[in-house]
């Protein structure tokens, strides 16, 4: 009787052994141990998750399955051939031996083998379908990720360009803010100074009002006395008129009128018909002392007496008290007219002062004071100014109230330091003050961060040295 036995070999393949008499038939079939069966927990919906499985793993698994399927196919073909060959031999043997049992057993074995092969094929088909399903899903997910990555990359590029634009705008604004900061400091200071000046003015006005009130009281008291005096005077005048009418003495009314040949200022020169710019000789009334001054007969109606000019640095302005008193330099170029002459002139009638300024960038500005005069030498030629207008700052760059004049040998400033020695030139220094038009002359591109230069704070700030300045005076009623 034939013995049929099924066992496993060492490499995990199913082994079918058929014993038939002295012949033994062994069939080796591969077992899909590394493939999951349909009852495996790894089911077809296992790929339905947010994040895809590792793509490389899937590809590897797919390759393994393909190899297994290829092996199976080869095995099946070999098995078919093998069965056919053996069946032929067996059939011959069966016919020879006429043993029906063996045929039945062989048929049974063949049937079993075919069933198992069919089962294996079905399992493989299931696995292949799962793998294909999974691969398709992975491909779709990869495509989705690729699209979202592209979208993100575009967004990042857009944001980067936006950031660059913002950075450019930011640096531009930063520069603007820094520039405004400097202007703001000067403007703030201007406001502070204006406030201080207004407070001083208010307190002065209060004291003047008090004085005026006292004077009104005194005037009221004196009014009656004056009326009596006026009455007495009228009587005296009438008496004198009567006496004069009876008098027989006669007088010659003609007085020789001498032609004016000397001028006190350029306004008088202008009015005499000399309307050309140039150097003229001026003489104060009741004086024989002459000074040479430059007359500007064109600017703002003409008649301007130039008392100071800076234009090229050709004249040294670091001079003594005496030199500033009498004047120095060249009237047709850089010069100082002289404090003594200006003091006497401006105390005889009301004068205006115009200060004309030039910077190194081609800009011009002016400050005009509606009333200007200098005290006498005994009061150190103290400057007095009222009523500022013009384009070189809303606040006066000559400190108010006026200061005494200082030179390198006459320290009359309000500083612990010696302003004239330190900042150079004679000027109405405070401590040391917002201006010095007689400072060191610095050429272009060397004119910034200069503390001893030609300075007009409320136009150009503290460290800027100007290109040119002109100080000119003219009678107020011209």
């Amino acid at each position: 009787y034939n013995n049929f036995r099924k066992s496993m070999d060492s490499i995990g393949k199913k082994q079918y052994q058929v014993q038939h008499g002295s012949c033994s038939y062994t069939f080796l079939l591969p077992e899909m141990d590394n493939c999951r069966s349909s009852s495996s927990p790894y089911v077809s919906n296992a790929v339905q998750r947010d994040a895809p499985l590792e793509y490389d793993d899937s590809v590897q698994r797919l390759q393994v399955l393909e190899n297994i399927m290829e092996n199976n196919t080869q095995w099946l073909m070999k098995l078919e051939n093998y069965i056919q060959d053996n069946m032929k031999k067996e059939m011959v043997e069966i016919q020879q031996n006429a043993v029906q049992n063996q045929t039945a057993v062989m048929i049974e074995i063949g049937t079993n083998l075919l069933n198992q092969t069919a089962e294996q094929t079905r399992k493989l088909t299931d696995v292949e379908a799962q793998v294909l399903n999974q691969t398709t899903r992975l491909e779709l997910q990869l495509l989705e990720h690729s699209l979202s990555t592209n979208k993100l990359e575009k967004q990042i590029l857009d944001q980067t360009s936006e950031i660059n634009k913002l950075q450019d705008k930011n640096s531009f604004l930063e520069k603007k803010v820094l520039a405004m900061e400097d202007k703001h400091i000067i403007q703030l200071q201007s406001i502070k100074e204006e406030k201080d000046q207004l407070q001083v003015l208010v307190s002065k006005q209060n004291s003047i009002i008090e004085e005026l009130e006292k004077k009104i009281v005194t005037a009221t008291v004196n009014n009656s006395v004056l009326q009596k005096q006026q009455h007495d005077l009228m009587e005296t005048v009438n008496n004198l008129l009567t006496m004069m009418s009876t008098s027989n003495s006669a007088k010659d009314p003609t007085v020789a009128k001498g032609e004016q040949i000397s001028f006190r200022d350029c306004a008088e020169v202008f009015k005499s018909g000399h309307t050309t710019n140039g150097v003229y000789t001026l003489t104060l009334p009741n004086s024989t002392e002459e000074v040479k001054a430059y007359c500007d007969m064109e600017a703002g109606g003409g008649g301007w007496t130039i008392i100071q000019r800076r234009e090229d640095g050709s004249v040294d302005f670091q001079r003594t008290w005496k030199e500033y008193k009498v004047g120095f330099g060249n009237p047709s170029g850089e010069y100082w007219l002289g404090n003594e002459f200006v003091s006497q002139l401006t105390n005889q009638q009301r004068y205006v002062l115009k200060i004309h300024l030039k910077d190194w960038e081609g800009n011009e500005a002016y400050s005009l004071y509606e009333h200007f005069y200098l005290s006498s030498e005994e009061l150190n030629y103290r400057i007095h100014l009222k009523g500022l207008t013009g384009t070189a700052g809303k606040i006066s760059s000559i400190s108010q109230p006026g200061n005494d004049f200082s030179t390198k040998d006459a320290d009359n400033d309000k500083c612990i330091c010696k302003c004239s020695q330190m900042l150079t030139g004679g000027w109405w220094f405070d401590a040391c003050g917002p201006s010095n038009l007689n400072g060191m002359y610095y050429p272009q591109r060397q004119n910034t961060n200069k503390f001893n230069g030609i300075k007009w704070y409320y136009w150009k700030g503290s460290g800027y040295s100007l290109k040119g300045t002109t100080m000119m005076i003219r009678p107020a009623g011209f």
Partner: nanobody
Framework: EVQLVESGGGLVQPGGSLRLSCAAS????????MSWVRQAPGKGLEWVST????????GYADSVKGRFTISRDNSKNTLYLQMNSLRPEDTAVYYC????????WGQGTTVTVSS
């Protein structure tokens, strides 16, 4: 009354260091840019360095760049100048100055660099 008082000057060897101070009073120190200016014997004023009111921006003359450092402490109303790697040509009277319309000045402090 406005006052600027400089201190910290003295005699130092070439390559040495000094720290100058300037104590301010009588005005709103924190509202103004401040500068250090020096005057060498027989010479005019020379700008050294400036710092803005908040202390965030500074400027230096080429002759001192990389050696001198300006700073300020607005809570103490004080301006400083740290001077390193001093040279004989740094010998001068050093003044602090406020960028105020008055351009306030102190009496100065003398720095002598000599071996």
């Amino acid at each position: 009354e406005v006052q600027l008082v400089e201190s910290g000057g003295g005699l130092v060897q070439p390559g040495g260091s000094l720290r100058l101070s300037c104590a301010a009073s009588g005005f709103t120190f924190s509202s103004y840019a401040m500068s250090w200016v020096r005057q060498a014997p027989g010479k005019g004023l020379e700008w050294v360095s400036t710092i803005n009111s908040g202390g965030g921006r500074t400027g230096y003359a080429d002759s001192v760049k990389g050696r001198f450092t300006i700073s300020r402490d607005n809570s103490k109303n004080t301006l400083y100048l740290q001077m390193n790697s001093l040279r004989p040509e740094d010998t001068a009277v050093y003044y602090c100055n406020a960028d105020h319309p008055q351009g306030y000045w102190g009496q100065g402090t003398t720095v002598t660099v000599s071996s």
